[in-house]
Interface confidence: low
């Protein structure tokens, strides 16, 4: 904590400007009015303050706003955001997407920090759901964001937001997350024609039930093995050999290389040997 000392004569700050970089920590504490700082936060980022000086500025804001900063200040925090703790951020009420973007920009290129994670948490909770603009923004900064959400949190994603999701955004999703996302994707893409629909729905198929896989098998989709290997085992097991052959098309030969891995292994064990032999791949049930 910086000691309370009187501001030397003539040093009282009238505005936030570059002259302040020459102030010692105690002078900043004594000579910069917290309310002035709050109203001129947008200037702080243009001034090359040291980390120690930024600590003092943060301390002043903390004293002025013990219950949490107002959004007008948060939006202009800039690099001062990196000084905030998750506990600080939990006091905030961030509702503007512009504020969120401004702070994510500060952290751009870095791994998602607990601070950023908490900020996003507060923002999404404040909005009540993950709308398309928010999802667009978050996945642009953090492609893995969607797969960081619990199934319950994903349930608040409206189907319209699914249009913002790219295949790479789902790379780290687990089956329970895809279980929630798949019905939303199905709804979002329902008016597309067969081949276009498959391109869009493919990344979400880890949440598809058996009946949907059966329906896809009738549409000459030629699913690749990588997608097939991500399907739910319980959804694949009831498929017949003929259905799997139609589903995979020319990729059916890849089953041989995957015969020891789930879901292929379990599916093979469910089939009659005569049916497997029709594939001509030497699969043993």
């Amino acid at each position: 904590e910086v000691e309370k000392t009187a501001c030397p004569s003539g040093k009282k700050a009238r505005e936030i400007d570059e002259s302040l970089i020459f102030y010692k920590k105690w002078e900043l504490e004594a000579c910069v009015d917290a309310a002035l700082l709050a109203t001129q936060m947008d200037r702080v980022n243009a001034i090359p303050f040291t980390y120690e000086q930024l600590d003092v500025l943060k301390h002043k804001l903390d004293e002025l706003y013990p219950q949490g900063y107002p959004e007008s200040v948060i939006q202009h925090l800039g690099y001062l955001f990196l000084k905030m703790s998750p506990e600080d951020i939990r006091k905030w009420n961030v509702t503007s997407l512009e504020t969120l973007k401004a702070l994510l920009e500060v952290n751009k290129g870095h791994e998602m920090s607990p601070q950023v994670a908490t900020l996003i948490d507060r923002f999404v909770k404040g909005r009540g759901q993950l709308d398309k603009d928010t999802l667009d923004t978050l996945t642009a900064f953090y492609p893995g964001y969607l797969c960081s959400l619990s199934p319950e949190e994903l349930s608040s994603v409206p189907p319209s937001s699914i249009w913002a999701v790219r295949p790479q955004d789902l790379d780290t999703c687990d089956p329970r997350q895809l279980d929630v996302l798949y019905p939303k994707a199905r709804l979002a893409f329902q008016n597309m024609n067969g081949s276009e629909y498959f391109v869009k729905i493919q990344s979400f198929l880890g949440g598809a039930p058996t009946e949907d896989l059966k329906a896809l098998s009738q549409q000459n989709v030629s699913m690749d093995l990588a997608t097939f290997m991500k399907l739910r085992t319980d959804a694949v097991l009831p498929l017949t050999v003929a259905e799997v052959q139609k589903l995979l098309g020319p990729h059916v030969e890849g089953l041989k290389a995957e015969e020891r891995h789930r879901p292929v292994r379990d599916w093979i064990l469910r089939q009659r040997q005569d049916d497997l032999d029709t594939l001509g791949l030497g699969l043993q049930g």
């Epitope: 998750p86 506990e87 939990r90 791994e111 998602m112 920090s113 607990p114 994670a117 908490t118 996003i120 948490d121 893995g144 797969c147 960081s148 959400l149 619990s150 199934p151 319950e152 949190e153 780290t172 329970r176």
Partner: nanobody, 124 residues
Framework: QVQLQESGGGLVQAGGSLRLSCEAS????????KAWFRQAPGKEREFVAS????????AYADSVKGRFTVSRTYAKNTVYLQMNSLKPEDTAVYYC?????????????????WGQGTQVTVSS
């Protein structure tokens, strides 16, 4: 309701390693195990490590950084704490905690469910 069951504690010599596990059962779609805290005799419970839903975001107490690693699996709703280079001051009862938010956090108030704890004793 969520039930948390810790295991893997025990007696180990200084410099040794242990791996704690915490398995969750019950309403785990909403609440999932994501943090470890510890409490030494006569001291307050303190934060050790936390992990986010996706498994890539983590947070650690300064005292364990570089020695402890938190990780989790999806299918079994299990969170792990790999403890290496153990010191006598790591001796404590280790508790697993489950919460609903997806960000890792050191704030014990963010966790709704707690395990019974597993004893870790590091002898010199």
């Amino acid at each position: 309701q969520v039930q948390l069951q810790e295991s893997g504690g025990g007696l180990v010599q200084a410099g040794g390693s242990l791996r704690l596990s915490c398995e969750a059962s019950g309403h785990t779609d909403s609440y999932y195990p994501k943090a470890w805290f510890r409490q030494a005799p006569g001291k307050e419970r303190e934060f050790v490590a936390s992990i986010g839903w996706g498994g890539r975001m983590t947070a650690y107490a300064d005292s364990v950084k570089g020695r402890f690693t938190v990780s989790r699996t999806y299918a079994k709703n299990t969170v792990y704490l790999q403890m290496n280079s153990l010191k006598p001051e790591d001796t404590a009862v280790y508790y697993c905690a489950a919460g609903i938010g997806w960000a890792p956090t050191a704030d014990s108030g963010e966790y709704d469910y707690w395990g019974q704890g597993t004893q870790v004793t590091v002898s010199s």
